[in-house]
Amino acid sequence: IPVIEPSVPELVVKPGATVTLRCVGNGSVEWDGPPSPHWTLYSDGSSSILSTNNATFQNTGTYRCTEPGDPLGGSAAIHLYVKDPARPWNVLAQEVVVFEDQDALLPCLLTDPVLEAGVSLVRVRGRPLMRHTNYSFSPWHGFTIHRAKFIQSQDYQCSALMGGRKVMSISIRLKVQKVIPGPPALTLVPAELVRIRGEAAQIVCSASSVDVNFDVFLQHNNTKLAIPQQSDFHNNRYQKVLTLNLDQVDFQHAGNYSCVASNVQGKHSTSMFFRVVESAYLNLSSEQNLIQEVTVGEGLNLKVMVEAYPGLQGFNWTYLGPFSDHQPEPKLANATTKDTYRHTFTLSLPRLKPSEAGRYSFLARNPGGWRALTFELTLRYPPEVSVIWTFINGSGTLLCAASGYPQPNVTWLQCSGHTDRCDEAQVLQVWDDPYPEVLSQEPFHKVTVQSLLTVETLEHNQTYECRAHNSVGSGSWAFIPISAGAHTHPPDEFLFTP
């Protein structure tokens, strides 16, 4: 950002004074200020000097310094007051043009900030402002009439109190122009259309404007259609309507239809697409994978997108098993219409229970027939573990059964002392069983695996622990040999599976 010297945001000087404003930047800098006489400009690389040897009230204004090469577009400003006892106002423009509801700035700049307390805005010849004129004053910029109305198109003067008397500026003419309406407003109904060959169809193009002078037409694939026009006037607007009625559609009627309206302000157009099909259609699809895996206790939303014409005559979600004959609750099924021919159907399955794994099918029907889309839902479970001591072929063996989904991995640990769970400090040996025997592996069920650890002699002051883990969690079981026989410990946090 450039820097201005002197280092003040505003300066007050007397008429006839010498004023030198210096702007320094990293690159070249430029001055911008009100058009006024007597300024000279001297540039020297990264600095620029604006100076006058004879300041007048007309030099009152804001001088801005910019650095054109600065990508951030930074600027610095200083406001100069040249306080002339005879000239309290410097008027920068004598005509101001705005549209209705815009703010109108009347640029009469105060030449002495001390006078601010006694300023007012009046109409010429001392007439008061019109009622409801909302305005504000800035000594740097002038008076602003907020949200100007057409009726406020008047000649104004800025007034300042000097030594007990009001001193007026030259007049400023304000022209408030009515907002010229843009191109006509349009509607084209329907936004999309599908018909089977031989059916009837209707397309309606309508345009409205505050002014009667506008044209509207309907075109099919860039060909203007000759359609009788209906005209109306209501809600202070002129309306023109074109209705295309087709008794028996054929493939040549398909394509793009555009509704176009124009006036002196310009042109508006809106389009729709008309599809003609040979027969009814019904398409089901999903953005989701049809094979879903979810952890038990979590929720899942199954979503199906339906594209159909004619509309659906029936639809429902069905549970196909294998666990129970329960059916999805209707209140958990939700349907939303994206547009006339596309719908989304959602089945919410909150807090999934083991008996809710299996196949879910969405069925829909229209004159084109039945369609179905089936999801397969498998539940994930953390492993459950149990250990028993047995003899196999005469050898003492620890047998660990672990069930869960996905298939659990098994690790054996031997550690010193009697404990519910081996910690690192106690571990004497670790065995990973890379290929536990799969005892059961049915669709939608847990996978049960078995791992054997042959132990020649059970050490009585030691613990044998079987640990199983999968992507959901882990489980373990500690086996503690006791002289009176083997003793097993499930972990304290033994998992309860509903």
Epitope: V3, E5, P6, S7, V8, P9, T20, P113, S138, W140
Partner: antibody, heavy 112, light 106 residues
Framework: QVQLQESGPGLVKPSETLSLTCTVS????????WSWIRQPPGKVLEWIGY???????NYNPSLKSRVTISVDTSKNQFSLKLSSVTAADTAVYYC??????WGQGTTVTVSS | DIQMTQSPSTLSASVGDRVTITCRAS??????LAWYLQKPGKAPKLLIY???SLESGVPSRFSGSGSGTAFTLTISSLQPDDFATYYC????????FGQGTKVEIK
């Protein structure tokens, strides 16, 4: 006749933030520019910074990292915040309108 | 930073004397210089701005001159109310003050 009045705690602990308020009466804070200046005991005047009604602010480079000057136009007040103070910040603090109207000053001592 | 050096630091004078205080800037400040008067326990009061412009309400016995780096404050005829400390201040680049000149009764 515009008058300025400084207010705030007379004692601030080291490392804390000094907060002062200047109340403007007899005129609007929505024009001119307003500054803070301080004078340590028996020492030279030191400019802290100013802000202008159009949103322009400028701070003494040696204090910039610790200073914030803000304005509340609804209360016709502006304030100074100086963070991480030390004994060297002990001074009489003045608020001013431009260079011509000054408050009478308020003494701030930094001590534990 | 621009340094401002005032001289003398102390000046003894009598009522009616013509008094001159000088202020020197470490680099050119054009004529962006102000002079203040300060009495013990009081806020400074603006006397001169833009090196030579007299602030409204200030007696005409005070005048300022100079540009660039050398500036002078002159009191044409010292009055009892003028015994105080005087400060110069540059506002060309940020603001800095001189160290002050104390005018005391001789």
């Amino acid at each position: 006749q515009v008058q300025l009045q400084e207010s705030g705690p007379g004692l601030v602990k080291p490392s804390e933030t000094l907060s002062l308020t200047c109340t403007v009466s007899g005129g609007s804070i929505s024009s001119y520019y307003w500054s803070w200046i301080r004078q340590p005991p028996g020492k030279v005047l030191e400019w802290i910074g100013y802000f202008s009604y159009n949103g322009n602010t400028n701070y003494n480079p040696s204090l910039k990292s610790r200073v914030t000057i803000s304005v509340d136009t609804s209360k016709n007040q502006f304030s100074l915040k100086l963070s991480s103070v030390t004994a060297a910040d002990t001074a009489v603090y003045y608020c001013t309108r431009g260079m011509d109207v000054w408050g009478q000053g308020t003494t701030v001592t930094v001590s534990s | 930073d621009i340094q401002m050096t005032q001289s003398p630091s102390t000046l003894s004078a009598s009522v009616g004397d013509r008094v001159t205080i000088t202020c020197r800037a470490s680099q050119s400040i054009s004529d962006w210089l102000a002079w203040y008067l300060q009495k013990p326990g009081k806020a400074p009061k603006l006397l001169i701005y833009k090196a030579s412009s007299l602030e409204s309400g200030v007696p005409s016995r005070f005048s300022g001159s100079g540009s660039g780096t050398a500036f002078t404050l002159t009191i044409s005829s010292l009055q009892p109310d003028d015994f105080a400390t005087y400060y110069c201040q540059q506002y060309n680049s940020h603001w800095t003050f001189g160290q002050g000149t104390k005018v005391e009764i001789k």
